[in-house]
């Protein structure tokens, strides 16, 4: 048992033209986090297996906001090590996959959005208990600098953490430079003495007298870097820097083959021989498989149909991207018409319509009065996205549902007496006055002050009742016509209204879920 430790030193734009200025999208600030995946590296099925040695996720780094006109700096990184505990023996050779993820902190409906910025995969040889190994890797336009090591956790010791030692109550029984080791309490062993001069930093040994080199170093004493990538000094746990033997220029200069691929020169070009599970001209297609859980947000991982794609992700509603890492901003397409408010609920889209509109996308232009008929023969008056009821006589309130006393306002002038009637009110005028509201004086010569009034029509005339009856019949006919019109309108819009009410109910339920 033991722990693999990874220290990220820097992540930023690589050298050369076309380097990105910022890891953030135009939506605003973001922060970085890292994911590490370890696989045993020598077994035939290594590329198809999951992160069998373990995986870890870093904390989120500090928020990064791009400064206008400022040079792109190394980006703020999460604090601390990434630690991957392993339970069994340390395999020595392994695949190291490091992913850099971006978390966007702009106004994302439903939370932050993630996207994969860079992924590097390297096959490495590393003995447990050895010094920090340092590396620099390019992934597209990005450059990642990091160190790593594997260390055993007591009682495990050795380059594979397979030997068990435990402290003794009487350690003096072992001579100087010797250590007690299980299974026998009195058994002492010497740690292997490496070949004289073997690099303490880049070499190690499992048997006395040998000198085995860490990845990137060669020579009898592990002093010779195998490529220029080892020449780069890093701000790492070890501050020592090394000299370099820079090979002459050539197609394989710097080893263009990623993921542990070996480079061989061809006339004017190069050819990469990729390890099992890696593909592409430069072995750049990752060997991550479905068992590694590469699909974010619960996405379904399916093995790729062709050799160049290790997997594909079938994303849950509301997510997209090759790893389901991007939250779909479906509202940016402005699907809600007529000024409707768009709500992306993750698994579904909802439009909250303005008054007077309905339908899944607010596409139906409703009459303001539709479905909101005024009761008791009142007429609906439209205006400015609202509605108002003009009530029939005898009724009042917002929807004409309240019975009103038509005589309460004393409508009969000149002392006329008011009588409530189903069609409104009737005024019995005092002597000397006439008219619907007793508003016209009657002159002594029998002619009213109203020139257009028919001669001979007086308050006491028997004809008056007939005229009132005619007026009543006309009013009832008009009211009946309005009611029929309103009912037909209600029927026509009922289905839209019903759909809109259902939509609102669903939206309320889902927003509160």
């Amino acid at each position: 048992a033991g722990v693999f430790e990874l220290q990220i030193h820097s992540f930023g734009p690589g050298p050369g033209p076309g380097a990105p200025r910022s890891p953030c999208s135009a939506r605003g600030p973001c922060r970085l986090f890292f994911r590490v995946c370890l696989k045993p590296g020598l077994s035939e099925e290594a590329a198809e297996s999951p992160c069998a040695l373990g995986a870890a996720l870093s904390a989120r780094g500090p928020v990064y906001t791009e400064q206008p006109e400022a040079p792109a700096p190394d980006l703020p990184l999460p604090n601390g090590l990434l630690q991957v505990p392993f339970r069994d023996a340390w395999p020595g050779t392994f695949s190291l996959i490091i992913e850099t993820w971006r978390e966007e902190l702009g106004d994302q409906i439903g939370g932050p959005a993630w996207s994969l910025l860079a992924r590097v995969t390297r096959r490495r040889r590393l003995a447990a208990g050895g010094p920090w190994a340092r590396d620099i890797q390019r992934a597209g336009a990005w450059e990642l600098r990091f160190s790593y090591r594997a260390r055993c956790e007591l009682p495990a010791v050795g380059t594979a953490c397979t030997r068990l030692c435990r402290p003794r109550s009487a350690p003096s029984r072992c001579g100087p430079g010797l250590r007690p080791c299980a299974p026998l309490e009195d058994e002492c062993e010497a740690p292997p003495v490496c070949r004289a001069g073997c690099s303490l930093e880049h070499g190690f040994c499992e048997q006395p007298g040998e000198c085995r080199c860490l990845e990137g170093w060669t020579g009898p004493l592990c002093m010779v870097p195998v490529s220029t990538s080892s020449c780069l000094g890093l701000r790492g746990p070890s501050s020592t820097t090394t000299g370099c033997l820079v090979p002459g220029p050539g197609p394989c200069d710097g080893n263009p083959c990623a993921n542990g691929g070996s480079c061989s020169e061809t006339p004017g070009s190069f050819e990469c021989t990729c390890p099992r599970g890696f593909y592409g001209l430069r072995c750049e297609v990752s060997g991550v498989t479905c068992a590694d859980g590469p699909c974010f947000n619960g996405g379904l991982c399916v093995g790729g149909a062709d050799p160049d794609s290790a997997y594909i992700c079938h994303c849950p509603p509301g997510f997209q991207g090759s790893n389901c890492e991007k939250r779909v901003d479906r509202c940016s397409l402005q699907p809600c018409r007529n000024g409707g408010l768009c709500l992306d609920l993750g698994h579904a889209l909802r439009c909250r319509c303005r008054a007077g509109f309905a339908g899944p996308r607010c596409e139906h232009d409703l009459d303001d009065c539709a479905g909101r008929a005024c009761a008791n023969g009142g007429t609906c008056v439209e205006g400015g996205g609202a509605h108002r009821c003009s009530c029939a006589l005898g009724f009042g309130g917002r929807n004409c549902r309240e019975r009103a006393d038509p005589c309460a306002a004393r409508p009969c002038a000149h002392g006329g007496r008011c009588y409530a009637h189903f069609s409104g009110l009737v005024c019995a005028c005092a002597p000397g006055y006439m008219g619907a509201r007793c508003e016209f004086p009657v002159h002594p010569d029998g002619v009213s002050a109203l020139p257009a009034a028919p001669p001979g029509l007086r308050p006491g005339d028997p004809q008056r009742a007939g005229v009132i009856a005619v007026i009543v019949v006309v009013v009832i006919a008009i009211v009946a016509g309005i009611v029929v019109l309103v009912i037909s309108r209600k029927k026509r819009m009922a289905k839209y209204e019903k759909a809109e009410i259902k939509e609102m109910g669903e939206m309320h339920r889902e927003l509160n879920a």
């Epitope: 986090f33 995946c37 999951p50 992160c51 995986a55 870890a56 996720l57 068992a291 590694d292 859980g293 590469p294 699909c295 947000n297 619960g298 996405g299 379904l300 991982c301 079938h314 849950p316 509603p317 993750g346 698994h347 579904a348 889902e510 879920a513």
Partner: antibody
């Protein structure tokens, strides 16, 4: 090969408690959403609840029928997800399966929970 | 919650015959429907996702179709090992829900 193995089922009285475990192998467990789905005898499938990842602050979601009584947790270092069931009712009698992801791609063999007096 | 209704409840067929199973959703679920197979004493197994995509390792005789509210699982020529209960599940709206199942039995 991916394997999910549930355990912890058994006979319990109404009002009692039980804790189910599901151990995963063959996958990078810490990267998978985990669900519990149950199946009452002779009946269909019912989703019980879900736990997401460390990067999601281990967010949990539950079916209305178990909300407030059941709790899902996970221990990534042990490749294990748990279902703590309290205040059990006779209608909780079922085979309980653990499954992965949003789409329930991998399933365990199930463990039987019987709630009876 | 979205309700899924499967029909028929039981389908009696002989090996080699074509099986057509139906699943209707109470509201639009797009193509977010999966089909699962469950044999007696076993756990369910994902067959089809996204209404029409075969999951890894599923034989070509299984196919799915439909969108919106009406979905179909077709087994072109029944093999002896295909006699089981089949469930549809919707993944459009949280929480996910399942149909009541269709039992495909030997005639």
């Amino acid at each position: 090969e991916v394997q999910l193995v549930e355990s912890g089922g058994g006979l319990v009285k109404p009002g009692g408690s039980l804790r189910l475990s599901c151990v995963a192998s063959g996958i990078t467990f810490s990267n998978f959403w985990m669900n519990w789905v149950r199946q009452a005898p002779g009946k269909g499938l019912e989703w019980v609840g879900q736990i997401r990842l460390k990067s999601d602050d281990y967010a949990t979601h539950y079916a209305e029928s178990v909300k407030g009584r059941f709790t899902i947790s996970r221990e990534d270092s042990k490749n294990t997800v748990y279902l703590q069931m309290n205040s059990l009712k006779t209608e909780d009698t079922a085979v309980y399966y653990c499954t992965t992801g949003y789409y329930f791609d991998y399933w365990g063999q199930g463990t039987t929970v019987t709630v009876s007096s | 919650n979205i309700v899924l209704t499967q029909s028929p409840a039981t389908l009696s067929l002989s090996p080699g015959e074509r099986a057509t199973l139906s699943c209707k959703a109470s509201e639009n679920v797009g193509t977010y429907v999966s089909w699962f197979q469950q044999k007696p004493g076993q756990s369910p197994r994902l067959l089809i996702y996204g209404a029409s995509n075969r999951y890894t390792g599923i034989p070509a005789r299984f196919s799915g179709s439909g969108s919106g509210t009406d979905f179909t699982l077709t087994i072109s020529s029944l093999e002896p090992e295909d006699f089981a209960v089949y469930y549809c599940g919707q993944f459009y709206s949280f929480p996910s829900t399942f149909g009541g199942g269709t039992k495909v039995e030997i005639k």
